[in-house]
Amino acid sequence: FNISGCSTKKLLWTYSTRSEEEFVLFCDLPEPQKSHFCHRNRLSPKQVPEHLPFMGSNDLSDVQWYQQPSNGDPLEDIRKSYPHIIQDKCTLHFLTPGVNNSGSYICRPKMIKSPYDVACCVKMILEVKPQTNASCEYSASHKQDLLLGSTGSISCPSLSCQSDAQSPAVTWYKNGKLLSVERSNRIVVDEVYDYHQGTYVCDYTQSDTVSSWTVRAVVQVRTIVGDTKLKPDILDPVEDTLEVELGKPLTISCKARFGFERVFNPVIKWYIKDSDLEWEVSVPEAKSIKSTLKDEIIERNIILEKVTQRDLRRKFVCFVQNSIGNTTQSVQLKEKRG
């Protein structure tokens, strides 16, 4: 289709080479009252109804995205050619940063409902650059945490080094929805609820003598509980003795509950005590078996190919640790009688 009638928007993505970050493009198709470029300008006034209702902002889940190759080749369907770009309704998600994402992206409705809708499309010229200087040492992260039940704030990474007074007007979106009243470089959240978790986008306009473009950053906001004040507790094994059959294989499971920590480095390991000696056992990797907002249950098994007489004289110890402290639970094997 002819893209010369598309409205054009220029966007800049300056990504940090130090962190993982995502980016999004919204299919900003015009609403009915802004639909002056959603129909062919060549039509005579007699042929053009006074109001040309475009498909309307409620129908934007069904749009098609293309990339325009720089060599002038035909438009490419995003879904077929770019695995690191995902379409979700009318939003295009870039999962990995890189200058190779620079280019022109076009979106238009899949269903052309009338001949006037043919040129109803938006062309987004995206320029992607790595952040060059570390002029702002403490710029806000693209991953921000909000503590449930307390007051918090969400900062626009590309503007977090500017004071509120010198900051330009910012446009914020939450999960693709415009937050019309939020206009500063920082959103204050009076009281944090689960509701506040999501993908936030902040845009501001930057201009030079030649043109202006939208600088965009994406912030993933997570709502969290406060760091635990407790050391982990061992849920299993509960008993300190275990009846076993000699010569048979045996798996002993250690399950421990770790309270939430923002910087989470759980330790769960097995070691063996034999008289005065003790050594750590090489066992399968630990696995998370349940994760909630407040805590996580992690399991790690010790596997004996067959229980020997020597194993009955040993203690098998599960050791778990977080930043607060550690807990141990030892198990003595006992031969089954009868």
Partner: antibody
Amino acid sequence: EVQLEESGGDLVQPGGSLRLSCAASGFSFSSSYYMCWVRQAPGKGLEWVACIYAGSSGSTYYASWAKGRFTISRDNSKNTLYLQMNSLRAEDTAVYFCARGAGSNGDFNLWGQGTLVTVSS
Amino acid sequence: DIQMTQSPSSLSASVGDRVTITCQASEDIESYLAWYQQKPGQAPKLLIYRASTLASGVPSRFSGSGSGTDFTLTISSLQPEDFATYYCQCTIYGVNFVPNAFGGGTKVVIK
């Protein structure tokens, strides 16, 4: 008993100023409530004026028409909400209600009985 | 500011009638909408919050529905004590649950 009681309503000349108070009892201001002012002109509908968050952020929110002329504030130690009204006009004549907004629902679950402000020469 | 548009501005009905009042927000407010009832000389009383949750002590003949920009308050069988003025209100402001703009009100009068 949990209640809100407004005071300070009066007859004032156009261009004048007035400060309304709202005393809360039976609950603590420092809890996570939005304390707000709503007004109702004689025979007209409800009109939101302003809110202040009683928690730590102390954020304030105003209807666009109220910005600049009206100032909402609070004194947590006195459990009292205030509305400072400057450059008053005839169209500010109304019953001013104090109301409490609750948590994550944002609705007004507690209202005062209102205080009448009359702006007239 | 968000604008809330309520219709009709008044309606006349009889006891036992089913009454429907609509409210439209100027932008998407998800389900952050409350409905109030006000009688002459009294402060408003909360009926419904979060678009469809009945406030404590409110009779089940009152119900609310809708999300996004379009909302409805329904009284399934009008009772004599229901003749009053009803208001909708937006209860989200940006990302905060701040009670703010009201609709213009709907006066329910006896036919």
